[in-house]
Protein backbone atom coordinates (compact mmCIF):
# COMPACT_ATOMS: atom_id res chain seq x y z
CA UNK A 1 0.00 0.00 0.00
CA UNK A 2 1.16 3.49 -0.76
CA UNK A 3 1.48 5.94 2.09
CA UNK A 4 -0.19 9.28 1.62
CA UNK A 5 1.68 12.45 2.40
CA UNK A 6 -0.28 13.50 5.47
CA UNK A 7 -2.05 16.84 5.25
CA UNK A 8 -0.17 17.82 2.11
CA UNK A 9 -1.91 18.58 -1.13
CA UNK A 10 1.26 19.96 -2.74
CA UNK A 11 3.17 16.85 -3.66
CA UNK A 12 5.19 18.28 -6.55
CA UNK A 13 8.09 20.71 -6.45
CA UNK A 14 8.05 21.07 -2.67
CA UNK A 15 10.56 21.33 0.14
CA UNK A 16 10.21 19.45 3.37
CA UNK A 17 9.78 21.30 6.65
CA UNK A 18 13.02 20.27 8.31
CA UNK A 19 16.19 21.69 9.81
CA UNK A 20 18.04 23.24 6.87
CA UNK A 21 15.59 23.13 3.95
CA UNK A 22 14.47 26.22 2.09
CA UNK A 23 10.72 26.75 2.26
CA UNK A 24 10.49 26.95 -1.52
CA UNK A 25 12.61 25.27 -4.21
CA UNK A 26 14.48 27.33 -6.75
CA UNK A 27 17.74 27.69 -8.68
CA UNK A 28 21.01 27.53 -6.73
CA UNK A 29 23.91 28.19 -9.11
CA UNK A 30 26.66 27.49 -6.62
CA UNK A 31 25.68 24.09 -5.24
CA UNK A 32 28.80 22.26 -4.23
CA UNK A 33 30.32 19.17 -5.85
CA UNK A 34 28.03 16.14 -5.40
CA UNK A 35 24.98 18.35 -4.85
CA UNK A 36 25.49 20.20 -8.13
CA UNK A 37 22.97 18.07 -10.09
CA UNK A 38 20.19 19.91 -8.19
CA UNK A 39 21.42 23.41 -9.04
CA UNK A 40 18.56 24.17 -11.49
CA UNK A 41 15.98 23.55 -8.78
CA UNK A 42 16.90 22.84 -5.18
CA UNK A 43 15.64 22.86 -1.62
CA UNK A 44 19.15 23.38 -0.24
CA UNK A 45 21.31 26.49 -0.18
CA UNK A 46 24.87 26.64 -1.48
CA UNK A 47 26.21 26.86 2.07
CA UNK A 48 24.25 23.76 3.13
CA UNK A 49 25.62 21.90 0.11
CA UNK A 50 29.15 22.99 1.01
CA UNK A 51 28.80 22.05 4.66
CA UNK A 52 27.38 18.58 4.07
CA UNK A 53 30.52 17.52 2.20
CA UNK A 54 32.60 18.01 5.36
CA UNK A 55 33.41 15.26 7.85
CA UNK A 56 31.30 15.85 10.97
CA UNK A 57 29.64 18.85 9.35
CA UNK A 58 27.88 21.42 11.51
CA UNK A 59 24.55 20.53 9.87
CA UNK A 60 23.98 17.58 12.20
CA UNK A 61 27.36 17.05 13.91
CA UNK A 62 27.19 13.58 12.44
CA UNK A 63 30.49 11.72 12.21
CA UNK A 64 30.69 9.20 9.37
CA UNK A 65 34.03 8.04 10.78
CA UNK A 66 32.60 6.73 14.06
CA UNK A 67 34.42 3.40 13.57
CA UNK A 68 37.63 4.60 12.01
CA UNK A 69 38.01 6.19 8.60
CA UNK A 70 35.13 5.42 6.28
CA UNK A 71 36.35 4.38 2.83
CA UNK A 72 36.04 7.32 0.38
CA UNK A 73 34.13 5.11 -2.09
CA UNK A 74 31.59 4.49 0.67
CA UNK A 75 31.47 8.04 2.01
CA UNK A 76 30.47 9.46 -1.37
CA UNK A 77 27.18 7.55 -1.15
CA UNK A 78 26.42 9.09 2.23
CA UNK A 79 27.21 12.53 0.85
CA UNK A 80 24.94 11.82 -2.13
CA UNK A 81 22.22 10.54 0.19
CA UNK A 82 22.50 13.80 2.17
CA UNK A 83 22.38 15.85 -1.04
CA UNK A 84 19.19 14.07 -2.05
CA UNK A 85 17.72 14.60 1.42
CA UNK A 86 18.63 18.30 1.63
CA UNK A 87 18.25 19.37 -2.00
CA UNK A 88 15.56 17.34 -3.75
CA UNK A 89 12.25 19.09 -4.49
CA UNK A 90 10.87 15.81 -5.86
CA UNK A 91 10.16 13.80 -2.74
CA UNK A 92 6.77 15.34 -1.92
CA UNK A 93 4.81 12.10 -2.33
CA UNK A 94 6.81 10.56 0.53
CA UNK A 95 6.75 13.42 3.05
CA UNK A 96 5.30 12.49 6.43
CA UNK A 97 4.66 14.67 9.46
CA UNK A 98 6.73 13.84 12.52
CA UNK A 99 6.88 15.14 16.05
CA UNK A 100 10.62 15.70 16.42
CA UNK A 101 12.41 18.60 18.06
CA UNK A 102 14.60 19.23 15.03
CA UNK A 103 12.15 18.78 12.16
CA UNK A 104 8.42 18.68 11.48
CA UNK A 105 8.56 16.39 8.44
CA UNK A 106 10.54 13.44 7.14
CA UNK A 107 10.57 11.14 4.11
CA UNK A 108 9.17 7.63 4.38
CA UNK A 109 9.55 4.75 1.92
CA UNK A 110 11.07 6.74 -0.94
CA UNK A 111 11.41 4.11 -3.72
CA UNK A 112 15.16 4.11 -4.31
CA UNK A 113 16.31 2.60 -7.60
CA UNK A 114 17.66 -0.87 -6.94
CA UNK A 115 21.02 -0.23 -8.61
CA UNK A 116 21.67 2.84 -6.44
CA UNK A 117 21.08 0.76 -3.33
CA UNK A 118 23.14 -2.17 -4.60
CA UNK A 119 26.10 0.05 -5.45
CA UNK A 120 25.88 1.86 -2.09
CA UNK A 121 26.03 -1.47 -0.31
CA UNK A 122 28.83 -2.84 -2.48
CA UNK A 123 30.97 0.25 -1.93
CA UNK A 124 30.36 0.25 1.83
CA UNK A 125 30.18 -3.33 2.98
CA UNK A 126 33.83 -3.42 4.05
CA UNK A 127 33.73 -0.09 5.90
CA UNK A 128 32.95 -0.26 9.61
CA UNK A 129 30.02 0.84 11.76
CA UNK A 130 28.52 -0.08 15.13
CA UNK A 131 24.78 0.32 14.48
CA UNK A 132 22.13 -0.82 12.02
CA UNK A 133 19.89 2.24 12.54
CA UNK A 134 21.66 5.58 12.42
CA UNK A 135 18.67 7.69 13.41
CA UNK A 136 18.70 6.76 17.08
CA UNK A 137 20.68 5.21 19.89
CA UNK A 138 23.94 7.13 19.51
CA UNK A 139 25.93 8.52 22.41
CA UNK A 140 25.73 12.28 21.84
CA UNK A 141 27.32 13.35 25.15
CA UNK A 142 30.35 14.79 23.36
CA UNK A 143 28.18 16.74 20.91
CA UNK A 144 29.08 14.32 18.11
CA UNK A 145 27.64 10.84 17.57
CA UNK A 146 29.73 8.09 19.15
CA UNK A 147 29.04 4.37 19.36
CA UNK A 148 26.96 3.60 22.43
CA UNK A 149 28.69 1.64 25.18
CA UNK A 150 29.19 -1.95 24.16
CA UNK A 151 28.17 -1.46 20.52
CA UNK A 152 31.00 -3.09 18.60
CA UNK A 153 32.45 -1.78 15.37
CA UNK A 154 32.13 -4.39 12.67
CA UNK A 155 31.95 -4.35 8.89
CA UNK A 156 28.84 -2.85 7.30
CA UNK A 157 28.13 -6.33 6.00
CA UNK A 158 27.74 -7.51 9.61
CA UNK A 159 25.13 -4.89 10.42
CA UNK A 160 23.63 -4.69 6.93
CA UNK A 161 23.78 -8.20 5.45
CA UNK A 162 21.89 -7.18 2.29
CA UNK A 163 21.52 -4.00 0.24
CA UNK A 164 17.92 -3.64 1.47
CA UNK A 165 19.05 -3.90 5.09
CA UNK A 166 21.30 -0.91 4.47
CA UNK A 167 19.04 1.31 2.40
CA UNK A 168 15.86 0.61 4.36
CA UNK A 169 17.22 0.15 7.87
CA UNK A 170 19.83 2.88 8.00
CA UNK A 171 17.45 5.85 8.24
CA UNK A 172 14.37 4.12 9.68
CA UNK A 173 12.72 3.34 6.33
CA UNK A 174 13.27 6.72 4.72
CA UNK A 175 13.96 4.58 1.66
CA UNK A 176 12.54 1.36 0.41
CA UNK A 177 14.35 -0.52 -2.33
CA UNK A 178 12.36 -0.36 -5.55
CA UNK A 179 12.09 -3.27 -7.95
CA UNK A 180 12.45 -0.70 -10.71
CA UNK A 181 15.70 0.28 -12.37
CA UNK A 182 17.36 3.61 -12.99
CA UNK A 183 15.81 5.37 -15.96
CA UNK A 184 12.45 3.63 -15.56
CA UNK A 185 10.67 6.76 -14.32
CA UNK A 186 9.34 4.68 -11.43
CA UNK A 187 12.13 4.99 -8.86
CA UNK A 188 14.15 7.80 -7.29
CA UNK A 189 17.76 8.09 -8.40
CA UNK A 190 20.27 9.22 -5.81
CA UNK A 191 22.76 9.72 -8.64
CA UNK A 192 21.94 11.38 -11.95
CA UNK A 193 23.49 13.50 -14.67
CA UNK A 194 21.70 16.84 -14.66
CA UNK A 195 22.64 17.46 -18.31
CA UNK A 196 19.68 15.22 -19.11
CA UNK A 197 17.47 17.01 -16.58
CA UNK A 198 16.36 15.66 -13.23
CA UNK A 199 14.79 12.20 -13.74
CA UNK A 200 13.14 12.35 -10.32
CA UNK A 201 10.64 14.97 -11.49
CA UNK A 202 8.89 12.37 -13.63
CA UNK A 203 8.96 9.87 -10.76
CA UNK A 204 7.33 12.33 -8.38
CA UNK A 205 4.64 13.12 -10.96
CA UNK A 206 3.86 9.43 -11.41
CA UNK A 207 3.50 8.70 -7.70
CA UNK A 208 1.64 11.93 -6.98
CA UNK A 209 -0.89 11.02 -9.66
CA UNK A 210 -1.21 7.51 -8.24
CA UNK A 211 -1.88 8.94 -4.79
CA UNK A 212 -4.63 11.23 -6.04
CA UNK A 213 -6.31 8.26 -7.69
CA UNK A 214 -6.44 6.31 -4.39
Amino acid sequence: TMCSAQDRTDLLNVCMDAKHHKTKPGPEDKLHDQCSPWKKNACCTASTSQELHKDTSRLYNFNWDHCGKMEPACKRHFIQDTCLYECSPNLGPWIQQVNQSWRKERFLDVPLCKEDCQRWWEDCHTSHTCKSNWHRGWDWTSGVNKCPAGALCRTFESYFPTPAALCEGLWSHSYKVSNYSRGSGRCIQMWFDSAQGNPNEEVARFYAAAMHVN
Epitope: C67, H125, T155, S158
Partner: antibody, heavy 118, light 109 residues
Framework: EVQLVQSGAEVKKPGASVKVSCKAS????????MHWVRQAPGQRLEWMGW????????KYSQKFQGRVTITRDTSASTAYMELSSLRSEDTAVYYC???????????WGQGTLVTVSS | SSELTQDPAVSVALGQTVRITCQGD??????ANWYQQKPGQAPVLVIY???NRPSGIPDRFSGSSSGNTASLTITGAQAADEADYYC???????????FGGGTKLTVLG
Amino acid sequence: EVQLVQSGAEVKKPGASVKVSCKASGYTFTSYAMHWVRQAPGQRLEWMGWINAGNGNTKYSQKFQGRVTITRDTSASTAYMELSSLRSEDTAVYYCARDISYGSFDYWGQGTLVTVSS
Amino acid sequence: SSELTQDPAVSVALGQTVRITCQGDSLRSNYANWYQQKPGQAPVLVIYGQNNRPSGIPDRFSGSSSGNTASLTITGAQAADEADYYCDSRVSTGNHVVFGGGTKLTVLG
Protein backbone atom coordinates in the same frame (compact mmCIF):
# COMPACT_ATOMS: atom_id res chain seq x y z
CA GLU B 1 48.54 1.97 12.06
CA VAL B 2 46.74 -0.77 13.98
CA GLN B 3 49.06 -2.85 16.16
CA LEU B 4 48.56 -5.59 18.74
CA VAL B 5 51.65 -6.19 20.86
CA GLN B 6 51.70 -9.19 23.18
CA SER B 7 53.74 -9.93 26.28
CA GLY B 8 56.79 -12.19 26.15
CA ALA B 9 57.23 -15.94 26.33
CA GLU B 10 56.43 -17.76 29.57
CA VAL B 11 57.52 -21.06 31.10
CA LYS B 12 55.11 -22.48 33.68
CA LYS B 13 54.81 -25.58 35.82
CA PRO B 14 51.76 -27.86 35.58
CA GLY B 15 48.93 -26.61 37.81
CA ALA B 16 50.07 -22.98 37.61
CA SER B 17 48.35 -20.07 35.85
CA VAL B 18 49.55 -17.76 33.09
CA LYS B 19 48.35 -14.27 32.14
CA VAL B 20 49.13 -12.99 28.66
CA SER B 21 48.63 -9.33 27.72
CA CYS B 22 47.79 -7.74 24.37
CA LYS B 23 48.27 -3.98 24.02
CA ALA B 24 46.29 -2.35 21.20
CA SER B 25 47.15 0.87 19.42
CA GLY B 26 46.12 2.70 16.26
CA TYR B 27 42.36 2.38 16.79
CA THR B 28 39.67 2.94 19.43
CA PHE B 29 40.22 -0.06 21.68
CA THR B 30 36.72 -0.05 23.19
CA SER B 31 35.02 -0.17 19.77
CA TYR B 32 36.09 -3.68 18.80
CA ALA B 33 35.93 -7.21 20.16
CA MET B 34 39.19 -8.95 21.00
CA HIS B 35 39.51 -12.71 20.61
CA TRP B 36 42.11 -15.17 21.85
CA VAL B 37 43.26 -18.08 19.70
CA ARG B 38 45.96 -20.62 20.47
CA GLN B 39 48.04 -23.01 18.41
CA ALA B 40 49.88 -25.98 19.85
CA PRO B 41 53.08 -26.98 18.00
CA GLY B 42 52.20 -28.40 14.59
CA GLN B 43 48.48 -28.20 15.37
CA ARG B 44 45.43 -26.28 14.13
CA LEU B 45 44.31 -22.86 15.35
CA GLU B 46 41.95 -23.19 18.31
CA TRP B 47 39.50 -20.47 19.38
CA MET B 48 39.39 -19.76 23.12
CA GLY B 49 37.02 -16.87 23.62
CA TRP B 50 36.42 -13.16 23.19
CA ILE B 51 35.73 -9.96 25.07
CA ASN B 52 33.67 -6.95 24.07
CA ALA B 53 36.27 -4.31 24.89
CA GLY B 54 33.53 -1.71 25.26
CA ASN B 55 31.45 -3.30 28.00
CA GLY B 56 33.61 -6.19 29.18
CA ASN B 57 31.18 -8.96 28.21
CA THR B 58 32.89 -12.26 27.47
CA LYS B 59 32.20 -15.54 25.66
CA TYR B 60 34.35 -18.62 26.10
CA SER B 61 34.80 -21.86 24.19
CA GLN B 62 33.25 -24.73 26.11
CA LYS B 63 36.60 -26.49 26.02
CA PHE B 64 38.17 -23.75 28.17
CA GLN B 65 35.14 -22.71 30.21
CA GLY B 66 36.12 -22.49 33.88
CA ARG B 67 39.86 -22.34 33.13
CA VAL B 68 40.11 -19.21 30.99
CA THR B 69 39.37 -15.61 31.99
CA ILE B 70 39.55 -12.76 29.48
CA THR B 71 39.64 -9.21 30.86
CA ARG B 72 40.57 -5.76 29.64
CA ASP B 73 41.92 -2.48 30.96
CA THR B 74 40.40 0.27 28.83
CA SER B 75 42.72 2.95 30.24
CA ALA B 76 45.70 0.94 29.01
CA SER B 77 43.99 -0.32 25.79
CA THR B 78 45.06 -3.79 26.82
CA ALA B 79 43.30 -7.16 26.80
CA TYR B 80 44.38 -10.06 29.00
CA MET B 81 43.93 -13.82 28.81
CA GLU B 82 44.51 -15.86 31.94
CA LEU B 83 44.59 -19.65 31.76
CA SER B 84 44.66 -21.64 35.00
CA SER B 85 45.37 -25.25 36.01
CA LEU B 86 47.94 -25.54 33.26
CA ARG B 87 48.91 -28.92 31.84
CA SER B 88 51.51 -29.94 29.30
CA GLU B 89 48.91 -29.94 26.49
CA ASP B 90 48.49 -26.18 27.04
CA THR B 91 51.95 -25.61 25.57
CA ALA B 92 51.12 -23.40 22.59
CA VAL B 93 51.46 -20.02 20.98
CA TYR B 94 48.64 -17.77 22.20
CA TYR B 95 47.38 -15.00 19.91
CA CYS B 96 45.07 -12.05 20.44
CA ALA B 97 43.14 -10.92 17.36
CA ARG B 98 40.80 -8.03 16.58
CA ASP B 99 37.36 -9.01 15.30
CA ILE B 100 35.68 -7.03 12.53
CA SER B 101 32.82 -9.35 11.68
CA TYR B 102 31.91 -12.33 13.83
CA GLY B 103 35.16 -14.22 13.50
CA SER B 104 36.92 -12.14 10.83
CA PHE B 105 40.21 -11.30 12.52
CA ASP B 106 41.91 -8.51 10.61
CA TYR B 107 44.83 -7.85 12.98
CA TRP B 108 46.71 -10.37 15.11
CA GLY B 109 49.28 -10.05 17.84
CA GLN B 110 52.70 -11.53 17.21
CA GLY B 111 51.93 -14.48 19.50
CA THR B 112 53.14 -15.48 22.95
CA LEU B 113 54.71 -18.90 23.49
CA VAL B 114 53.61 -20.50 26.74
CA THR B 115 55.54 -23.65 27.67
CA VAL B 116 54.17 -25.88 30.39
CA SER B 117 56.82 -28.23 31.72
CA SER B 118 57.72 -29.79 35.02
CA SER C 1 28.13 -30.33 15.17
CA SER C 2 30.28 -27.22 14.99
CA GLU C 3 33.24 -28.83 13.25
CA LEU C 4 34.82 -27.42 10.09
CA THR C 5 36.55 -29.97 7.87
CA GLN C 6 39.43 -29.19 5.50
CA ASP C 7 41.62 -31.42 3.35
CA PRO C 8 44.95 -31.74 5.17
CA ALA C 9 47.09 -31.10 2.09
CA VAL C 10 46.68 -29.80 -1.45
CA SER C 11 49.26 -29.11 -4.14
CA VAL C 12 49.19 -26.93 -7.23
CA ALA C 13 51.58 -26.26 -10.10
CA LEU C 14 53.01 -22.76 -10.26
CA GLY C 15 50.65 -20.45 -12.13
CA GLN C 16 47.72 -22.86 -11.97
CA THR C 17 44.43 -22.47 -10.10
CA VAL C 18 43.72 -24.26 -6.85
CA ARG C 19 40.62 -24.52 -4.70
CA ILE C 20 40.74 -25.18 -0.97
CA THR C 21 37.47 -26.22 0.65
CA CYS C 22 35.95 -26.04 4.10
CA GLN C 23 32.84 -27.98 5.11
CA GLY C 24 30.58 -27.66 8.12
CA ASP C 25 27.02 -27.11 9.29
CA SER C 26 27.75 -23.58 10.51
CA LEU C 27 28.50 -22.56 6.89
CA ARG C 28 24.84 -22.97 5.94
CA SER C 29 24.08 -19.74 7.78
CA ASN C 30 27.46 -18.04 8.20
CA TYR C 31 30.25 -16.98 5.88
CA ALA C 32 33.68 -18.53 6.21
CA ASN C 33 36.81 -16.45 6.70
CA TRP C 34 40.16 -17.58 5.33
CA TYR C 35 43.63 -17.13 6.81
CA GLN C 36 47.09 -17.75 5.43
CA GLN C 37 49.77 -18.80 7.89
CA LYS C 38 53.44 -19.22 7.14
CA PRO C 39 55.83 -21.04 9.51
CA GLY C 40 56.61 -19.06 12.65
CA GLN C 41 54.19 -16.25 11.76
CA ALA C 42 50.77 -15.13 12.91
CA PRO C 43 47.85 -15.88 10.57
CA VAL C 44 46.88 -13.27 7.97
CA LEU C 45 43.26 -12.70 6.93
CA VAL C 46 42.93 -13.17 3.15
CA ILE C 47 39.14 -13.44 2.59
CA TYR C 48 36.24 -12.57 4.85
CA GLY C 49 32.48 -12.23 4.62
CA GLN C 50 30.81 -12.66 1.28
CA ASN C 51 34.05 -12.38 -0.69
CA ASN C 52 36.01 -9.47 0.74
CA ARG C 53 39.77 -9.06 0.50
CA PRO C 54 41.55 -6.90 3.06
CA SER C 55 43.77 -4.24 1.52
CA GLY C 56 47.11 -5.66 0.44
CA ILE C 57 45.74 -9.10 -0.40
CA PRO C 58 46.23 -9.85 -4.14
CA ASP C 59 43.11 -10.29 -6.26
CA ARG C 60 44.15 -13.83 -7.18
CA PHE C 61 42.53 -14.81 -3.87
CA SER C 62 38.74 -15.15 -3.92
CA GLY C 63 36.07 -16.82 -1.82
CA SER C 64 32.74 -18.45 -2.53
CA SER C 65 30.21 -20.64 -0.78
CA SER C 66 27.43 -23.08 -1.52
CA GLY C 67 25.36 -24.93 1.03
CA ASN C 68 27.62 -26.18 3.79
CA THR C 69 30.85 -25.72 1.81
CA ALA C 70 33.07 -22.65 1.51
CA SER C 71 35.92 -22.42 -0.97
CA LEU C 72 39.07 -20.36 -1.25
CA THR C 73 40.33 -20.13 -4.82
CA ILE C 74 43.81 -18.98 -5.77
CA THR C 75 43.96 -18.18 -9.48
CA GLY C 76 47.53 -18.31 -10.78
CA ALA C 77 49.24 -19.63 -7.66
CA GLN C 78 52.64 -18.12 -6.82
CA ALA C 79 55.50 -19.60 -4.81
CA ALA C 80 54.71 -17.04 -2.09
CA ASP C 81 51.28 -18.65 -1.65
CA GLU C 82 52.81 -21.81 -0.19
CA ALA C 83 51.45 -21.84 3.38
CA ASP C 84 48.85 -23.33 5.68
CA TYR C 85 45.30 -22.08 5.05
CA TYR C 86 42.64 -22.09 7.75
CA CYS C 87 38.95 -21.38 7.50
CA ASP C 88 36.88 -20.19 10.41
CA SER C 89 33.24 -19.40 10.92
CA ARG C 90 30.90 -17.98 13.47
CA VAL C 91 28.75 -20.57 15.20
CA SER C 92 25.49 -18.66 15.54
CA THR C 93 24.49 -20.34 18.78
CA GLY C 94 26.34 -18.40 21.43
CA ASN C 95 28.48 -16.30 19.09
CA HIS C 96 31.33 -18.76 19.25
CA VAL C 97 33.97 -19.23 16.55
CA VAL C 98 35.30 -22.50 15.15
CA PHE C 99 38.40 -23.11 13.01
CA GLY C 100 38.97 -25.77 10.39
CA GLY C 101 41.88 -28.18 10.71
CA GLY C 102 43.95 -26.31 8.12
CA THR C 103 45.17 -27.19 4.61
CA LYS C 104 48.85 -27.24 3.76
CA LEU C 105 49.25 -25.81 0.26
CA THR C 106 52.35 -26.81 -1.70
CA VAL C 107 53.21 -24.91 -4.88
CA LEU C 108 55.13 -27.16 -7.28
CA GLY C 109 57.75 -26.01 -9.74
